[in-house]
């Protein structure tokens, strides 16, 4: 049970996980005027990775889309890629992790299978939310260099007459968004892993026997009354409904921890 | 068309107050800042302040802050503009006007006249 | 607050003749985030309210003859007249956009000989 719970809560973290960085690459605001030298602007401007955009205070905004590739920073480039990446394995590692879930019955699937695509997925959600992360951090890290870097041009080279503030930027709401995302895609991986442990059945130096009895078509399991730990284990006497699940007579032997000769 | 129609000229005593009006025709009034602004006799325009009619939300030049009121009637489509404490130095023309792409004002109301003697 | 310096005060011109009027900013008007100066031109005649004519320093409003031009950049900006009519006779106004409180210039005025 606590497997399934921690595999399922992993995908769902994930999902909002992928579901922010989706979102945050798609964001104008990753960058924002910083308003310290003019709280009263009538002109506020904003930039994302893919656009620039400028709100008047008359309530119009206007956006120019970035039409250049060579002429962008490669910085700019670098962090646009990071996104991509941590969206596109994000969402490989969905839909792996949809077969996977505990929850879902596909075929004759064995535990074996499902522990592997939940350990791919899982490893996928943490490499995604490590790129969504990093991406950010690179963004936030120029962004800082930038702020001081106009800042000290403010400072310097002032006519003494006139004022020409440059316009500075600082840490818009998209930087927050990612780096939240990032984090919840990584912890759901993270989980994802974990519940991989618990899904792999262990390895032991016994198999299972079967004892044919002439006649009679019927395996016979040795310990077959005894109780069986781990999930999806049936229970004597009890028909459980589980995707094609048999009474504990009619079930075929398979190894298991239990299995003596 | 849009068109803004501005309420009559007054004539007030010294320290009674006044409350001219802008009638908005033509266009989505509750969307657009309206900008009040005053001439004195034979002087330049300055900015009073601003009001956007969709939710009352204000911003006044520092030297009218206490003195003016900005106000707004979605349902009427019209903007008002409440002068107190009057003096002489209130006496002069405001003009109602929309804001608009690129923070200009583009349409003007006829202007109020506003003579404050006693 | 912003002040805008408008130079001359008054100028009395000839029919036909060109005309530029300036106006000068205490600071910048341009706009990095989309390379454009909130700067707006307005034309008074008397007896009326004022008209818009330029914003964005160069951008004609609709309607506005040509002869009318608009230049300049940051903190130093120009309105030109190509030819001037007798309809031109007015008050012109510079007005800032870009921060508040929302400023105009003292005004040229534009007179006939």
């Known amino acids: 049970m606590a497997v399934t719970a921690c595999q399922g809560l992993g995908f769902v973290v994930s999902l909002i996980g992928i579901a922010g960085i989706i979102a945050a690459t798609c964001m104008d605001q990753w960058s924002t005027q910083d308003l310290y030298n003019n709280p009263v602007t009538a002109v506020f401007n904003y930039q994302g990775l893919w656009r620039s955009c400028v709100r008047e205070s008359s309530g119009f905004t206007e956006c120019r889309g970035y039409f250049t590739l060579l002429g962008l920073p490669a910085m700019l480039q670098a962090v646009r890629a990071l996104m991509i990446v941590g969206i596109v394995l994000g969402a490989i590692g969905l839909l792996v992790s949809i077969f996977a879930l505990k929850c879902i019955r596909i075929g004759s699937m064995e535990d074996s299978a499902k522990a592997n695509m939940t350990l791919t997925s899982g490893i996928m959600f943490i490499v995604s939310g490590l790129c969504a992360i990093a991406g950010v951090s690179v963004f936030a890290n120029m962004l800082v260099t930038n702020f001081w870097m106009s800042t000290a041009n403010m400072y310097t080279g002032m006519g003494g007459m006139v004022q020409t503030v440059q316009t500075r930027y600082t840490f818009g709401a998209a930087l927050f968004v990612g780096w939240v995302a990032g984090g919840l895609t990584l912890i759901g991986g993270v989980m994802m892993c974990i519940a991989c442990r618990g899904l792999a059945p262990e390895e032991t130096n016994y198999k299972a026997v079967s004892y044919h009895a002439s006649g009679h078509s019927v395996a016979y399991k040795p310990g077959g009354f005894k109780a069986s730990t781990g999930f999806g284990s049936n229970t004597k006497n009890k028909k459980i409904y589980d995707g094609g699940a048999r009474t504990e007579d009619e079930v075929q032997s398979y190894p298991s921890k239990h299995d003596y000769v | 068309q849009v068109h803004l129609q501005q309420s009559g000229a007054e004539l007030v005593r010294p320290g009674s107050s006044v409350k001219i009006s802008c009638k908005a025709s033509g266009y989505a009034f509750s969307n657009y800042w309206m900008n009040w602004v005053r001439q004195r006799p034979g002087q330049g325009l300055e900015w009073i302040g601003q009001?956007?009619?969709?939710?009352?939300?204000?911003k006044y030049s520092g030297k009218f802050n206490s003195k003016d009121t900005l106000t707004a009637d979605k349902s009427s489509n019209t903007a008002y503009m409440q002068l107190n404490s009057l003096t002489s130095e209130d006496s002069a023309v405001y003009f109602c006007?929309?804001?608009?792409?690129?923070?200009?004002?583009?349409?003007w109301g006829q202007g109020t006249s506003v003579t404050v003697s006693s | 607050d912003i002040v805008l310096t408008q130079s001359p005060s008054s100028l009395t011109v000839t029919a036909g003749e060109k005309v530029t009027m300036s106006c000068k900013s205490s600071q910048t008007l341009l706009n990095g985030g989309n390379q454009k100066n909130y700067l707006t031109w307005y034309q008074q005649k008397s007896g009326q309210p004022p008209k818009l004519l330029i914003y964005w320093a160069s951008t004609r409003e609709s309607g506005v003859p040509d002869r009318f031009t608009g230049s300049g950049s940051g903190t130093d900006f120009t309105l030109t007249i190509s030819s001037v009519q007798a309809e031109d006779l007015a008050v012109y106004y510079c007005q800032n956009g870009y921060s508040y409180p929302l400023t105009f210039g003292v005004g040229t005025k534009l007179e006939l000989k």
């Open positions: 006007a929309r804001f608009y792409y690129g923070n200009v004002m583009d349409y």
């Open positions: 009001i956007y009619p969709g939710n009352g939300d204000t």
